[in-house]
């Protein structure tokens, strides 16, 4: 059946947040379809997203098997309507992705402030532990389960009446901070992996939560 008039994929890009991992590429297909293969450096190729007209392929199920491995993917181009035939010996055009190491490269998702509680001049702020699609036995693991002490959170907090921000850090999911009595404060958190040296070291900031709204609780 040949592979005339098929164009090799290009701009192969990994998009990954909290280990949810999608490979994207170009071009939008005209009279062609794609199949993706993924492998570890020492493993066999596994095919995914067979003969798809999409320009993305969700590879999460493969990479969560071992997020500390380094993966390579490749995208094959076939003529539209292509059916695998045992007689075909011609290799379709393909393009390799950059290498991808999930543990080092997945982006940290936007965190969420789960709750805050004021007792006198102290406020306890708790960050929600996000679930990932990484499994241990048959249970899904949280971001903390995967990264452990590699993951810290930075809290930004300020009086509702002013713009001067203070910061606090924790390697747990809780902060205990001192506040002025009678003042309302606003909070935002950011997830950080200090050991990373790249742009994906930090998450985006969480939505801002302010005292006097429903997430908070105040006790004298």
């Amino acid at each position: 059946s040949g592979t005339t008039n098929t164009v090799a994929a290009y701009n192969l890009t990994w998009k990954s947040t909290n280990f949810k991992t999608i490979l994207e590429w170009e071009p939008k297909p005209i009279n062609q379809v794609y199949t993706v293969q993924i492998s570890t450096k020492s493993g066999d190729w596994k095919s995914k997203c067979f003969y798809t007209a999409d320009t993305e392929c969700d590879l999460t199920d493969e990479i969560v098997k071992d997020v500390k491995q380094t993966y390579l993917a490749r995208v094959f181009s076939y003529p539209a309507g292509h059916v695998e035939s045992t007689g075909s010996t011609e290799e379709p055009p393909y393009e390799n992705s950059p290498e991808f190491t999930p543990y080092l490269e997945t982006n940290l998702g936007q965190p969420t402030i789960q709750s805050f509680e004021q007792v006198g001049t102290k406020v306890n702020v708790t960050v929600q532990d996000e679930w990932t699609l990484v499994r241990r036995n048959d249970t899904f693991l949280s971001l903390r389960d995967v990264f452990g002490k590699d993951l810290i959170y930075t809290l930004y907090y300020w009086k509702s009446s002013s713009s001067g921000k203070k910061t606090a850090k924790t390697n747990t999911n809780e902060f205990l901070i001192d506040v002025d009595k009678g003042e309302n404060y606003c909070f935002s958190v950011q997830a950080v992996i200090p050991s990373r040296r790249t742009a994906n070291r930090k998450s985006t900031d969480s939505p801002v939560e302010c005292m006097g709204h429903e997430k908070g609780e105040s006790r004298e």
């Epitope: 708790t126 389960d145 002490k149 590699d150 999911n173 040296r197």
Partner: antibody, heavy 120, light 113 residues
Framework: EVQLVQSGAEVKKPGESLRISCKGS????????IEWVRQMPGKGLEWMGD????????NYSPSFQGHVTISADKSISTAYLQWSSLKASDTAMYYC?????????????WGQGTLVTVSS | DIVMTQSPLSLPVTPGEPASISCKSS????????????LTWYLQKPGQSPQLLIY???TRESGVPDRFSGSGSGTDFTLKISRVEAEDVGVYYC?????????FGQGTKLEIK
């Protein structure tokens, strides 16, 4: 099979420099912390520090900060522990270990140890 | 720094009998995010490198016999051996794997009576 192979025993004089090594194999070297642990003769285990080879990020115990340097060469899957000026009190067995797969899941694999003797 | 304190420091045991080692930390090792205790147990047999027995306070490392079990939460932890065998002799260490600097207990030497 995961293996950590350490360099051989060393006998040095006080004031000399030294670098010992730990070569990892059988796993993706860049994504696991390499830990260094000291055991002085007849004593317990002391954590010295660690390195994540993928980024070169290090952590040190305050007891060892400034006296030793931890580094790694990911191209040859090897981590190093070095001293610029040894003291007699550095005489000990030094172990490298690899972190577990999950977060904070201990030191899952250990090297055989490198015995360092510092004596005038 | 978190201080880890083990007791007893020496533990003579008759083969087939149970053994128990206590480990106390000066701060809680419980992670609020996932409710895991980051306490690890190791065994160093005579003349050997240490080996991992238990992580997350109660999760046995692959290949570790089920006569070893870990329990506890917060600051108080216990390693139990249901029936001691001759091959269990050595020094047992608990470790704070929760926060830097990582710290070990002083060790408990288990010997056969």
């Amino acid at each position: 099979e995961v293996q950590l192979v350490q360099s051989g025993a060393e006998v040095k004089k006080p004031g000399e420099s030294l670098r010992i090594s730990c070569k990892g194999s059988g796993y993706t070297f860049i994504t696991y912390w390499i830990e260094w642990v000291r055991q002085m003769p007849g004593k317990g285990l002391e954590w010295m520090g660690d390195i994540l080879p993928g980024s070169g990020s290090t952590n040190y115990s305050p007891s060892f900060q400034g006296h030793v340097t931890i580094s790694a060469d990911k191209s040859i899957s090897t981590a190093y522990l070095q001293w610029s000026s040894l003291k007699a009190s550095d005489t000990a067995m030094y172990y490298c270990a690899r972190s577990g797969y999950y977060g904070n899941s201990g030191f899952a694999y250990w090297g055989q140890g490198t015995l360092v003797t510092v004596s005038s | 720094d978190i201080v880890m304190t083990q007791s007893p420091l020496s533990l003579p045991v008759t083969p087939g009998e149970p053994a128990s080692i206590s480990c106390k930390s000066s701060q809680s090792l419980l992670s609020s995010g996932n409710q895991k205790n980051y306490l690890t147990w190791y065994l160093q047999k005579p003349g050997q490198s240490p080996q991992l027995l238990i992580y997350w306070a109660s999760t046995r490392e692959s290949g570790v016999p089920d006569r070893f079990s870990g329990s506890g939460s917060g600051t108080d932890f216990t390693l139990k051996i249901s029936r001691v065998e001759a091959e269990d002799v050595g020094v047992y260490y608990c470790q704070n794997d929760y926060t830097y600097p990582l710290t070990f207990g002083q060790g408990t030497k288990l010997e056969i009576k």
